[in-house]
Interface confidence: medium
């Protein structure tokens, strides 16, 4: 079995998480991809997904989450803007490949969001303010209505690097919903 590893991001409220998930180019370029949160003892919850088939370099925005799939480079870019403390948690990228269960991309992201603005460790201040300009070409995509029961149902033990975070609910709604968070102008 592949060892589940995590990479930790410590960011301040209002900043932007900006990560990439690499995938096998030939196999998954046009497959639909999703960004999920994993809570202890629960099924992974899909927060946003690309279109089906996934379009090249075409931003998809779901609330505060923006996905961009770069087919030529075999990577999915995920941005979570205007971060809130409640966004803290464990996240992962997956590739939908029905009827098979979703394919998880390594590594998982352990996000820790703390109060108070700081210019680091995210991007420069101009791109981490509370208002984030979204390209006008962004679209929304409906995510599949299933989560495989055989996907990991419990988060792995936290790595020694982790900072414990409260188990408060993240205001991002349920697994199959389009996230109802205001879109910034």
């Amino acid at each position: 079995a592949t060892k589940l590893t995590e990479e930790k991001y410590e960011l301040k409220e209002g900043q932007t998480l900006d990560v990439k998930c690499d995938y096998t180019l030939e196999k998954f370029a046009s497959s639909q991809k999703a960004w999920q949160i994993i809570r202890d003892g629960e099924m992974p919850k899909t927060l946003a997904c690309t279109e089906r088939p996934s379009k090249n370099s075409h931003p998809v925005q779901v609330g505060r989450i923006i996905l961009e799939d770069y087919h030529d480079h075999g990577l999915l870019r995920v941005r979570m803007v205007n971060l809130q403390v409640e966004d803290s948690g464990l996240y992962q990228c997956v590739i939908y490949q029905p009827p098979k269960e979703p394919h998880m991309l390594f590594d998982r992201i352990r996000l820790v969001v703390t109060k108070g603005f700081s210019g680091t460790p995210g991007s420069n201040e101009n791109s981490t303010q509370n208002v984030y300009k979204i390209p006008p070409t962004t679209t929304k995509a409906l995510c599949p209505l299933y989560t495989s029961p055989r996907t990991v149902t419990q988060a792995p033990p936290k790595s020694t690097a982790d900072v414990s975070t409260p188990d408060s609910e993240i205001n991002l709604t349920n697994v199959t919903d389009i996230i109802r968070v205001p879109v910034f102008n």
């Epitope: 995590e6 990479e7 930790k8 991001y9 410590e10 932007t16 900006d18 990560v19 990439k20 998930c21 690499d22 770069y70 480079h73 990577l75 870019r77 990228c93 991309l105 390594f106 590594d107 998982r108 992201i109 680091t120 460790p121 991007s123 420069n124 791109s127 790595s159 020694t160 690097a161 982790d162």
Partner: antibody, heavy 125, light 107 residues
Framework: QVQLVQSGAEVKRPGSSVKVSCKAS????????ISWVRQAPGQGLEWMGG????????NYAQQFQDRVTITADESTRTAYMELNSLKSEDTAVYYC??????????????????WGQGTTVTVSS | DIQMTQSPTSLSASVGDRVTITCRAS??????LAWYQHKPGKAPKLLIY???SLQSGVPSRFSGSGSGTDFTLTISSLQPEDFATYYC?????????FGQGTKLEIK
């Protein structure tokens, strides 16, 4: 195999700016982080920040946040580091280096495996 | 910021000796640690990544171990070309801080 070639040595006055370039040849440029690291005389290595050219969003160490600008031009496969409001303490050798691992996160690199030859910046009045 | 503390700061040894350099992080960094060798006038060279993985092309006499906060770099049998300054670097969280370095000199 990627190679990183940096611009030549610079001598600058206090208060001025310097812009160092780092051109990649061979290998992949766009999706790996290009980091900037400096070493002042008699001092250790200091990580300044990094950028993934494809994304264009830089990341800075806090002590440089207000003075450094890291950019990249995919078309010329070149990364740049500009440092403003130069002080004598900024006299150092500046290196660009490529992170070699994929991983999930934006700045994941599992170490810096390819380095430029270094650019000496001297700040003196 | 995560502080990285190396010990010793300098070390004298002879060819053939077994040498160990330690690096301690101010907080847990899992296995997100790299080791570099740096010689005057040259660019640093990556030796070890992910705490214990040997970088391609690096001699097997170099090895790394540890996780969490305590890490070691071991050179099993010193060769003349190994005399240099060694740095650890964490990349668990920003900024990706280096240790202050360990200068390895000929006895």
């Amino acid at each position: 195999q990627v190679q990183l070639v940096q611009s030549g040595a610079e001598v600058k006055r206090p208060g001025s700016s310097v812009k160092v370039s780092c051109k990649a040849s061979g290998g992949t440029f766009s999706i790996y982080v290009i980091s900037w690291v400096r070493q002042a005389p008699g001092q250790g290595l200091e990580w300044m920040g990094g950028i993934i050219p494809l994304f264009g969003t830089p990341n800075y160490a806090q002590q440089f946040q207000d003075r450094v600008t890291i950019t990249a031009d995919e078309s010329t496969r070149t990364a740049y580091m500009e440092l403003n409001s130069l002080k004598s303490e900024d006299t150092a050798v500046y290196y660009c280096a490529r992170g070699h691992g994929p991983g999930s996160s934006h700045y994941s690199y599992y170490g810096l495996d390819v380095w430029g030859q270094g650019t000496t910046v001297t700040v003196s009045s | 910021d995560i502080q990285m503390t190396q010990s010793p700061t300098s070390l004298s040894a002879s060819v053939g000796d077994r040498v160990t350099i330690t690096c301690r992080a101010s907080q847990g960094i899992s296995s997100w640690l790299a080791w570099y060798q740096h010689k005057p006038g040259k660019a640093p060279k990556l030796l070890i990544y992910a705490a214990s993985s040997l970088q391609s092309g690096v001699p097997s006499r170099f090895s790394g171990s540890g996780s969490g906060t305590d890490f070691t770099l071991t050179i099993s049998s010193l060769q003349p070309e190994d005399f240099a300054t060694y740095y650890c670097q964490q990349y668990n969280s920003y900024p990706y801080t280096f240790g202050q370095g360990t200068k390895l000199e000929i006895k």
